[in-house]
């Protein structure tokens, strides 16, 4: 039994890091493998993660972590019974994938303005809380070409757009994702999408 693709890990910079790897053949990850991880910190203890299958030869492990700070470093040991298959380390602050924003809501009752709001996925005491920026994706269910991205580079989790920038009388969907420039993170997953029917009053034409 050998590791084909070494474990790569990403952290949500809160409490969970996810590590994925591939074996050289079909593997029952949960019965055959264990990922031991330990914070490099005086007197800390090792923890065991039981991996799950992620495709035939792929494995994934969700590591529970103490509140993450930038200096944290973990040792990782991948075991198959008594055989050490791979040894490595992981610094969560250097491999951050933020949590996805939640509670995306479209408010359509503000004159002819659409107000989209969502929730920051971090508590106020987390470092990323004040460092997230967002991308909002809006698309038409009727017209695949009607697809747009709005970059929200301010901290407030909201976006205002004129309803008239979208077509009237049809349904749209929106979703939002986050990233943090300070840690050069990857983008989060997209939030669940929300749907609304776009309608607004066309201005009267003057002749």
């Amino acid at each position: 039994m050998k590791v084909l693709q070494e474990p790569t890990c990403v952290s949500d910079y809160m409490s969970i890091s996810t590590c994925e790897w591939k074996m050289n053949g079909p593997t029952n990850c949960s019965t055959e493998l264990r990922l031991l991880y330990q914070l490099v910190f005086l007197l800390s203890e090792a923890h065991t993660c039981i991996p799950e299958n992620n495709g035939g030869a792929g494995c994934v492990c969700h590591l529970l972590m103490d509140d993450v700070v930038s200096a944290d470093n973990y040792t990782l040991d991948l075991w198959a019974g008594q055989q050490l298959l791979w040894k490595g380390s992981f610094k969560p602050s250097e491999h951050v994938k933020p949590r996805a924003p939640g509670n995306l809501t479209v408010h359509t009752n503000v004159s002819d303005t659409l107000l989209l709001t969502w929730s920051n996925p971090y508590p106020p005491d987390n470092y990323l809380y004040n460092h997230l920026t967002y991308a909002v994706n809006i698309w038409s269910e009727n017209d695949p070409a009607d697809f747009r991205i709005y970059n929200v580079t301010y901290l407030e989790p909201s976006l205002r757009i004129a309803a008239s920038t979208l077509k009237s009388g049809i349904s749209y969907r929106a979703r939002v994702r986050a990233w943090a420039q300070c840690y050069n993170t990857t983008w989060s997953e997209w939030s669940p999408s929300t749907k609304w029917h776009n309608s607004y009053r066309e201005p009267f034409e003057q002749h």
């Epitope: 914070l39 490099v40 910190f41 005086l42 800390s44 103490d66 509140d67 700070v69 200096a71 470093n73 005491d125």
Partner: nanobody
């Protein structure tokens, strides 16, 4: 210059309690790792307890688990060690130690405070 100054040591009877304090001062108030070590007469240095910077999660040597409690007050830049159910084998010089960027807690040291457990 980082300075760590311990206080609170003394003579206590077996089964008694003491609370050690360590006041930190210097270039930055933030310390990634803070810990207590001890050295008993004629013995080597032993790590007693360590504490995380934000969560306050604590780690202990098996010999003191359930009896000692480490805590830190970041606003006062002070580290504490509450020692209960003291035993003769806890007699030692107790040192406060810290580090800024790694988990060894051994970049900065105090001068130590003597704890004697004897009847």
């Amino acid at each position: 210059e980082v300075q760590l100054v311990e206080s609170g040591g003394g003579l206590v009877q077996p089964g008694g309690s003491l609370r050690l304090s360590c006041a930190a001062s210097g270039s930055t108030s933030y310390r990634y790792c803070m810990a207590w070590f001890r050295q008993a007469p004629g013995k080597g240095l032993e790590a007693v307890a360590s504490i995380r910077p934000r969560s306050g999660r604590a780690y202990y040597a098996d010999s003191v688990k359930g009896r000692f409690t480490i805590s830190r007050d970041n606003s006062k830049n002070t580290l504490y060690l509450q020692m209960n159910s003291l035993r003769a084998e806890d007699t030692a010089v107790y040192y406060c130690a810290a580090s800024d960027n790694d988990g060894n807690c051994q970049d900065y040291w105090g001068k130590g405070t003597l704890v004697t457990v004897s009847s």
